[in-house]
């Protein structure tokens, strides 16, 4: 009796089960009662990443330098090209179709996580005892200066944007 369902890596056509083409190959002709499925390898600029019955391979992604993209991993007949962003830029989406400059953390905020080619800078507010007086994509919040260790006293309290100002202790006679 003709099958109604097929095994894994097979497909049903003309009341019979045919083998799917393996990753990296496209379908040329369906199987028959006498011949196996005919598949052909994808060309150098193309790929198919699953067991399939596609008659055309997919084009490898183009990492457009005009969009700040560069090749992270060259595509094969079974995998797509992986793009990443040039230095100082990161992807705008998971599929990394374009890049934007990393953001800087404003004064009062420090870098919690430095940006990569695929993720933006993560900033965090400087907690009490720490400050950042620059706009930077690299600098963390720095601790206030410890006046005591320098045998000095705090003359001006620090904020999240400014360091404490130390001064000499008043000498009592």
């Amino acid at each position: 009796e003709p099958p109604t369902a097929c095994r894994e890596k097979q497909y049903l056509i003309n009341s019979q089960c045919c083998s799917l083409c393996q990753p990296g190959q496209k379908l040329v002709s369906d199987c028959t009662e006498f011949t196996e499925t005919e598949c052909l390898p994808c060309s150098e600029s193309e790929f198919l990443d699953t067991w399939n019955r596609e008659t055309r391979c997919h084009q490898h992604k183009y990492c457009d330098p005009n969009l700040g993209l560069q090749v992270q991993q060259k595509g094969t007949s079974e995998t797509d090209t992986i793009c990443t962003c040039e230095e100082g830029l990161h992807c705008t989406s998971e599929s990394c179709e374009s890049c934007v400059p990393h953001r800087s953390c404003l004064p009062g905020f420090g870098v919690k996580q430095i940006a990569t080619g695929v993720s933006d800078t993560i900033c965090e507010p400087c907690p009490v005892g720490f400050f950042s007086n620059v706009s930077s994509a690299f600098e963390k919040c720095r601790p206030w200066t410890s006046c005591e260790t320098k045998d000095l006293v705090v003359q001006q309290a620090g904020t999240n944007k400014t360091d404490v100002v130390c001064g000499p202790q008043d000498r009592q006679r």
Partner: antibody
């Protein structure tokens, strides 16, 4: 027991016609594709024609296309090969063979076709 | 058309010896290859399917291997009834084609 029995072979003049038959028994004929394969005297095997289980698809190599026609009658468990415009190089033993899992798993004993003037 | 080349054309061996028959395809055919045995005056008989799968009723001394373009039929220890002609056949694409055959004869 699976059996395939060919008949209809004989001596025919170049340009002539012949119709071969293959009678099947011992299996559900309508569930299997069948092929004709020939063997010239002292030579190797050569595929001649194939027909799908339902008879809706037929396949031929270029050297017989347009001259040979494969057909079947599932009600009679019979396979046929109509051969026209016969040539000396068509001289061979003709076998019918069942297609099981894309292999020719059962063969008939063959029938000899001789094309000669 | 896929051309199958069998070698050697003739193999002269004694009973009990190991026979190694080769079949080479002109292009890759994965494992889409069968082996047949033919004795004089008889129809061919299926020995091995899909390059390496055994057939019910065929003695275990017959085995097949290979994939892509190079295939081998091995008879581990020749019996007197194994002296015959062996053909490979591809079913990867139309037209179906057979190799020219290897004759295994008694030395």
């Amino acid at each position: 027991e699976v059996q395939l029995v060919e008949s209809g072979g004989g001596l025919v003049k170049p340009g002539g016609s012949l119709r071969l038959s293959c009678a099947a028994s011992g299996f559900t004929f309508s569930n299997y594709g069948i092929s004709w394969v020939r063997q010239a005297p002292g030579k190797g095997l050569e595929w001649v024609a194939s027909i799908s289980s339902g008879g809706d698809n037929t396949y031929y190599p270029d050297n017989v296309k347009g001259r040979f026609t494969i057909s079947r009658d599932n009600a009679k468990n019979s396979l046929y090969l109509q051969m026209n415009s016969l040539r000396a190089e068509d001289t061979a033993v003709y076998y019918c063979a069942r297609a099981g899992e894309k292999a020719m798993d059962y063969w008939g004993q063959g029938t000899l076709v001789t094309v000669s003037s | 058309e896929i051309v199958l080349t069998q070698s050697p054309a003739t193999l002269s061996l004694s009973p009990g010896e190991r026979a190694t028959l080769s079949c080479r395809a002109s292009q890759t055919i994965n494992n889409n290859l069968h082996w047949y045995q033919q004795k004089p005056g008889q129809a061919p008989r299926l020995l091995i399917k899909y390059a390496s799968q055994s057939i019910s009723g065929i003695p275990a001394r017959f085995s097949g291997s290979g994939s892509g373009t190079d295939f081998t039929l091995t008879i581990s220890s020749l019996e007197p009834e194994d002296f015959a002609v062996y053909f490979c056949q591809q079913f990867s694409s139309w037209p179906l084609t057979f190799g020219g055959g290897t004759k295994v004869e008694i030395k």
